[in-house]
């Protein structure tokens, strides 16, 4: 028969055979032969492949740094990694949660709508035209442009989301 | 290596005051947001006050406000809270932060104790 050229799922093919994958939790220790089932062995104490697969290594549990203030929220398994939070108080800095923060800053463009507090983090919002933040702040809202208006003044530069307006004298050159 | 080191910490009467500090090292200080932390015995962290990087603005807690004032002097690198009024609820550890207020950089705080 005709050397297959493509698998059913959970096999691999190799070697012009379809050979079984190991199955989650296990790695690969020898390709299966026309007399053979592949062989697999399970993963080690902190280890685990969360696939079926065809590594020949397991993958290291992510290590929780107490001195990046991180604990572990859920231990792994050999089919599922480690998960890890920050301590009380603090905020992962990414869904990863590979660091935390005391709270996140909100970046020029956007105020701080809500304070962090220990179970949330800081809520930015963008500010909206009439205001701006030149800063990054975890406390600061976004501020209104000066009115040149009230000084007598004009505006000589626009303002953005991130500068405020430039006022100026008035043209007394006027018709 | 950036490193805040929180004094002034001690032991007052209800009513009393203390003037914390903060020394600043290893980053040009001026310009950053700096933040005061505490933390009560078997409570969570709470946000007390915050100054601007120019000390323009500043942040209070509800809890805080009318009793405490933030400052910072950038020619000596150093953060500051004044607290007056001080009550048996204000006993905690307090910690200055600073952006990106990474973990670590944390100091080892100063205990303040409000006990008659």
């Known amino acids: 028969p005709e050397p297959p050229t493509a698998c059913r799922e959970k096999q691999y093919l190799i070697n012009s055979q379809c050979c079984s994958l190991c199955q989650p939790g296990q790695k690969l220790v020898s390709d299966c032969t026309e007399f053979t089932e592949t062989e697999c062995l399970p993963c080690g104490e902190s280890e685990f492949l969360d696939t079926w697969n065809r590594e020949t290594h397991c993958h290291q549990h992510k290590y929780c740094d107490p001195n990046l203030g991180l604990r572990v929220q859920q231990k792994g398994t050999s089919e599922t990694d480690t998960i890890c939070t920050c301590e009380e108080g603090w905020h992962c800095t990414s869904e990863a949660c590979e660091s935390c923060v005391l709270h996140r800053s909100c970046s020029p463009g956007f105020g701080v709508k809500q304070i962090a507090t220990g179970v949330s983090d800081t809520i930015c919002e963008p500010c909206p035209v009439g205001f701006f933040s030149n800063v990054s702040s975890a406390f600061e809202k976004c501020h209104p442009w000066t009115s040149c208006e009230t000084k007598d003044l004009v505006v000589q530069q626009a303002g953005t989301n991130k500068t405020d307006v430039v006022c100026g004298p008035q043209d007394r050159l006027r018709a | 290596e950036v490193q805040l080191l929180e004094s002034g910490g001690g032991l007052v009467q209800p009513g009393g005051s203390l003037r914390l500090s903060c020394a600043a090292s290893?980053?040009?200080?001026?310009?950053?947001e700096m933040w005061w932390v505490r933390q009560a015995p078997g409570k969570g962290l709470e946000r007390v006050s915050a100054i601007s990087g120019s000390g323009g603005s500043t942040y209070y807690a509800d809890s805080v406000k009318g009793r405490f004032t933030i400052t910072r002097d950038d020619s000596k690198n150093t953060l500051y809270l004044q607290m007056n009024s001080l009550r048996a609820e204000d006993t905690a550890v307090y910690y200055c932060?600073?952006?990106?207020?990474?973990?670590?950089?944390w100091g080892q705080g100063t205990l303040v104790t409000v006990s008659s």
């Open positions: 932060a600073k952006e990106p207020y990474s973990f670590d950089y």
């Open positions: 290893g980053f040009t200080f001026a310009g950053y």
